[in-house]
Interface confidence: low
């Protein structure tokens, strides 16, 4: 580390005294200090001397002795006060720029120690300083002003009481800067904009920033509009306007809109689309078959998506029949808006139950009339089946009928023993019935099937067996025949009750 | 602030016509519907209709279709009501009112105007 | 059209207690009904939108219930200026209709 001579920290002199500093190192050594006149330099090696014949109040200042070489960068400094009964201040600078929220120093040096306890900060025109305003004094580097705000821009002096008035610095301004984290903020609205040709309309694009120095432009596809600018000052925020009124669109004012800003951080940019239509109009659309099949007691969400302009003035969900006047429950239809023209529309049908099938029409109104979307729904239902002994045609015939959906397929099971289902050990003949009579049919019903199976002879120690299945379940019914007459047992497991 | 400034009180002979006017400000006139209410003697309130300023478009009560008609003018955020062969059962009290710009929040009636009162009488 | 039907047009409440006010639709209205104070000589006030809503600056001891076809409107902590008239109305399908109104007087 540097040594300087003389070895002290401060050292006082007269104006017009001659001010000999030496600094001595293991190696070259450099003097830094604030600029001033009259000191000349003298340098053989390790040693420097800084000296003036005349100093003056301007000298006042800390001199720093480095040693460029030294690894540990170690260095030695002496403060010199030039006490001028009628310069207390040296300002080493009239412009001080810092951010918002840095610590200014306002770099008035005491050229007299002894001041120190009448020194004080003012504003230019012996204004006091503002509220809120934190600051310290150091006799060896002036004013700090901590944490500066933007409000605190201002021409400042340095005061100090000398024989009982004050005595003021030359004028210091502050220049606090707003920190700018990016381009300005910016906002252009509406997101998207739909329009019947001849009706008014108005695009906002505004942009924001902390400085007040930036650039805000409106484009129609790529054509620079020329629109007047509001400026405003609000949130410690500067805004700009610029507000695009169309009093009676037409498809030429169709198209993109890009408002555009920008600042020495850079640019933003955000577009909107803007269509022009020719009448109202209201589109009912879904993503969902309009034709739905659910198995009974399961749930079914129907969505319709709905663009529309002008905004809907009404809209239901309606149940058009055919088994019941229900109509849904209002809490089950559920409305969410993607944006100002599109919106999603879900009726919830839970635990659906037979009598909810059929057509559920979703209505929606807007000045450009109705529109209506229909979903037809149709229940599955795993078979039901029964078996009787009757003889047709003078045969004995047994017949069984399956009702389900979708439209049950038939297999009659002959085995051996009384049983409530034939088991494969068990099973003495298998027939598939390719083409059951179809009973009945209509459409959100079950469909109800007939096969016959002609028995010459009902063996008595057999089973016969009518399976139904579908793409839900199946269902059975076996017949036992006993010797008393036909008698019929349809296992407990394939009672169904929906 | 949004204000709703309605013409004054009207004594009007049977089988005239009269028009009352709604001026609107403290908003953007376009972006909301003006419904028309009556009052009758100080308690039922009747919906007559509405008007989309933005394109003119109107849709009424069935019950005061041919009664009321409903106008608006853009360049002065003005909405008008037209009662036509007026008699003694349209003395009322008339409210313009904004209404909701779309479905997502209804029509609520927000704002109304202060009144205007029509006296039917010869 | 629907029919909106208020049960009582008249109800007198002791200051500071609690009321409730009903609104029946003669059809399903999915929540779009609305309450309106009407204070003598004053226009209708809006309250409550949605059936749930409550407006800005309306005081909290206001609130709205119900679903389907029946509503409520609930006052607590009764104060001498919630004396007035107040509808309800649904704006679920043109024509908007209003209820008959309720007259709230205090005891």
């Known amino acids: 580390i540097p040594v300087i001579e003389p070895s002290v920290p401060e050292l006082v002199v007269k104006p017009g005294a001659t001010v000999t500093l030496r600094c001595v190192g293991n190696g070259s050594v450099e003097w830094d200090g604030p600029p001033s006149p009259h000191w000349t330099l003298y340098s053989d090696g390790s040693s420097s001397i800084l000296s003036t014949n005349n100093a003056t109040f301007q000298n006042t200042g800390t001199y720093r002795c480095t040693e460029p070489g030294d690894p540990l960068g170690g260095s030695a400094a002496i403060h010199l006060y030039v006490k001028d009964p009628a310069r207390p201040w040296n300002v080493l600078a009239q412009e001080v720029v810092v951010f918002e929220d840095q610590d200014a120093l306002l770099p008035c040096l005491l050229t007299d120690p002894v001041l120190e306890a009448g020194v004080s900060l003012v504003r230019v025109r012996g204004r006091p300083l503002m509220r809120h305003t934190n600051y310290s004094f150091s006799p060896w580097h002036g004013f700090t002003i901590h944490r500066a705000k933007f409000i605190q821009s201002q021409d400042y002096q340095c005061s100090a009481l000398m024989g009982g008035r004050k005595v003021m610095s030359i004028s210091i301004r502050l220049k606090v800067q707003k920190v700018i984290p990016g381009p300005p903020a910016l906002t252009l609205v509406p997101a998207e904009l739909v329009r019947i040709r001849g009706e008014a309309a108005q695009i906002v694009c505004s942009a924001s920033s902390v400085d007040v120095n930036f650039d805000v432009f409106l484009q129609h596809n790529n054509t620079k509009l020329a629109i007047p600018q509001q400026s405003d000052f609000h949130n410690n925020r500067y805004q700009k306007v610029l507000t695009l009124n169309l009093d009676q669109v037409d498809f030429q004012h169709a198209g993109n809109y890009s408002c555009v800003a920008s600042n020495v951080q850079g640019k933003h940019s955000t577009s909107m689309f803007f269509r022009v239509v020719e009448s109202a109009y209201l589109n009912l659309s879904s993503e969902q078959n309009l034709i739905q099949e659910v198995t009974v007691g399961e749930g079914l969400n129907l969505k319709v998506m709905v663009e529309a302009y002008p905004g809907l003035q009404g809209f239901n969900w309606t149940y058009l029949g055919p088994f019941s006047d229900h109509q849904p429950e209002p809490k089950l239809a559920n409305a969410t808006t993607k944006d100002t023209y599109r919106h999603t529309f879900t009726l919830s049908l839970p635990r659906l139950k037979p009598s909810e099938a059929g057509r559920y029409s979703f209505l929606a109104r807007n000045p450009g009339g109705w529109r209506a979307l229909t979903f037809e729904l149709t229940l599955r239902y795993p078979p039901e089946v029964s078996v009787i002994w009757t003889f047709i045609n003078g045969s004995g015939t047994l017949l069984c009928a399956a009702s389900g959906y979708p439209q049950p397929n038939v297999t009659w099971l002959q085995c051996s023993g009384h049983t409530d289902r034939c088991d494969e050990a068990q099973v003495l003949q298998v027939w598939d019935d390719p083409y059951p009579e179809v009973l009945s049919q209509e459409p959100f019903h079950k469909v109800t099937v007939q096969s016959l199976l002609t028995v010459e002879t009902l063996e008595h120690n057999q089973t016969y067996e009518c399976r139904a299945h579908n793409s839900v379940g199946s269902g059975s019914w076996a017949f036992i025949p006993i010797s008393a007459g036909a008698h019929t047992h349809p296992p407990d497991e394939f009672l169904f009750t929906p | 602030e949004v204000q709703l400034q309605q013409s004054g009180p009207e004594l009007v002979k049977p089988g005239a016509s009269m028009k009352i006017s709604c001026k609107a400000s403290?908003?953007?006139?376009?972006?909301?519907?003006v419904n028309w209410v009556k009052q009758s003697h100080g308690e039922n309130l009747d919906w007559i209709g509405l008007?989309?300023?933005?394109?003119?478009?109107?849709s009424y009560n069935h019950n005061f279709r041919g009664k009321a008609t409903l106008t608006v003018d853009k360049s002065s955020s003005t909405a008008y009501m037209e009662l036509l062969s007026l008699t003694s059962d349209d003395s009322a009290v008339y409210y313009c009112?904004?209404?909701?710009?779309?479905?997502?929040?209804?029509?609520?009636?927000?704002?109304w105007g202060q009144g205007t009162s029509v006296t039917v009488s010869s | 059209d629907i029919q909106m039907t208020q049960s009582s047009s008249y109800l007198s409440v002791s200051l500071g207690g609690t009321v409730t006010i009903n609104c029946k639709a003669s059809d399903h209205i999915h929540n779009w009904l609305a309450w309106y104070q009407q204070q003598p000589g004053n226009a209708p006030r809006l309250l409550i939108s949605?059936?749930?809503s409550l407006e800005t600056g309306v005081p909290s001891r206001f609130s709205g219930g119900g679903s389907g076809k029946d509503y409520s409107l609930i006052i607590t902590s009764l104060q001498t200026e919630d004396v007035a008239t107040y509808y309800c109305?649904?704006?679920?399908?043109?024509?908007?209709?209003f209820g008959g109104g309720t007259k709230l007087e205090i005891k």
């Open positions: 109305q649904q704006y679920w399908s043109i024509p908007w209709t």
């Open positions: 009112t904004r209404g909701g710009g779309d479905f997502t929040t209804g029509y609520t009636m927000d704002y």
């Open positions: 949605g059936a749930t």
């Open positions: 403290g908003y953007s006139f376009t972006d909301y519907t």
């Open positions: 008007i989309i300023p933005y394109n003119g478009g109107t």
